[in-house]
């Protein structure tokens, strides 16, 4: 599937649209809202009943080069006594984001959009239990 | 920008950094991953900090549909199925990159945009302070 063109009847393609070769699109990678700072809750990854750690992955052929991935610290969840309760499960919560991949073919370079699945944190769930005969 | 390793045999005219504007293939790699979190898992219902998913649609953006999580309760669900208000349901937020049509309504011209989305909720034990 390709990126959908604006096919809605209430949209008219403006005259000001830049010319783009067939099968490709123009992408400005100067990020909108690049400098907005988010006020994330302090230390939720440590205070959660399903705590997690962060790992930074780095790839120079990807834009952005740094992507942060979370990993659940435990299989179970942390109970009120601070002990792991394995009757509950710590599970990852994931979200898709877009990155630009730079590809080298000989001396030519091409760019490809890529969907990346990022693990953003963990949550504690009640497992679905099946008794196998 | 980002420094890119080059084939040493290539001409030196190539910029080491990502250029400000690039032409990219219309096909997106890994595009078939499931974008509806309701279909991918039922964690939003089974979590001790359950959440509802709200559809956010914007035809000037790709992807045009993004699902936003809102925690169902202030507290967390305990073993008896009741809300325990000594614990907190807290949204897990993530900055993601999307495409914004620029100029508006143009079919094949985009700019990257960073947006903050709530992906799900997690149960947190707060540190308690008694205010004098």
């Amino acid at each position: 599937r390709k990126i959908p063109k604006v096919g809605h009847t209430f949209f008219q393609k403006p005259e000001s649209c830049p010319p783009v070769p067939g099968g490709s699109m123009k992408l400005d990678i100067g990020i909108i809202n690049e400098n907005q700072r988010v006020s994330m809750s302090r230390n939720i990854e440590s205070r959660s009943t399903s705590p997690w750690n962060y790992t930074v992955t780095w790839d120079p052929n990807r834009y952005p080069s740094e992507v942060v991935q979370a990993q659940c610290r435990n299989l179970g969840c942390i109970n009120a006594q601070g002990k792991e309760d394995i009757s509950m499960n710590s599970v990852p919560i994931q979200q898709e984001t877009l990155v630009v991949r730079r590809k080298h073919q000989g001396c030519s370079v091409s760019f490809q959009l890529e969907k990346v699945l990022v693990t953003v944190g963990c949550t504690c769930v009640t497992p679905v239990i099946h008794h196998v005969q | 920008g980002i420094t890119i390793p080059r084939n040493p045999g290539c001409p030196n005219s190539e910029d080491k950094n990502f250029p400000r504007t690039v032409m990219v293939n219309l096909n997106i790699h890994n595009r078939n991953t499931n974008t509806n979190p309701k279909r991918s898992s039922d964690y939003y219902n089974r979590s001790t900090s359950p959440w509802n998913l709200h559809r956010n649609e914007d035809p000037e953006r790709y992807p045009s549909v993004i699902w936003e999580a809102k925690c169902r309760h202030l507290g967390c669900i305990n073993a008896d199925g009741n809300v325990d208000y000594h614990m907190n349901s807290v949204p897990i937020q993530q900055e993601i990159l999307v495409l914004r049509r620029e100029p508006p309504h143009c079919p094949n011209s985009f700019r990257l945009e960073k947006i903050l989305v709530s992906v799900g909720c997690t149960c947190v034990t707060p540190i308690v302070h008694h205010v004098a």
Partner: nanobody, 116 residues
């Protein structure tokens, strides 16, 4: 440091109304939710009502639903609890709670007495 100032407690007759207020001040903080617990002698503190700061979503204990209304003023960092149709069993010390997700602040409490 965070300060919480509670006001509005007192003694009333059953069926009467009372309005509690709580104002938060101090360092810059990002509020998760703001609300009220209550406690009677020999019992645990119980949740009464809370309001989420981001979207004004409210939650109430079953015992006060339909009688108590919680509201907020974003600009002033205040939360009010309008208590109508009060009952003797609402007699308790009411504590204001400011929740910042990973840190929670409790006020000193204000006495509410409802006599029959």
């Amino acid at each position: 440091e965070v300060q919480l100032v509670e006001s509005g407690g007192g003694s009333v007759q059953a069926g009467d109304s009372l309005r509690l207020s709580c104002a938060a001040s101090g360092r810059a903080f990002s509020i998760n939710w703001f609300g009220w617990f209550r406690q009677t002698p020999g019992k645990e503190r119980e949740f009464v009502a809370g309001i989420r700061w981001s979207d004004a979503y409210t939650e109430y204990a079953n015992s006060v639903k339909g009688r108590f209304t919680i509201s907020r003023d974003n600009a002033k960092n205040t939360v009010d609890l309008q208590m109508d149709s009060l009952k003797p069993e609402d007699t308790a010390v009411y504590y204001c709670v400011l929740d910042l997700s990973t840190v929670r602040y409790w006020g000193q409490g204000t006495q509410v007495t409802v006599s029959s």
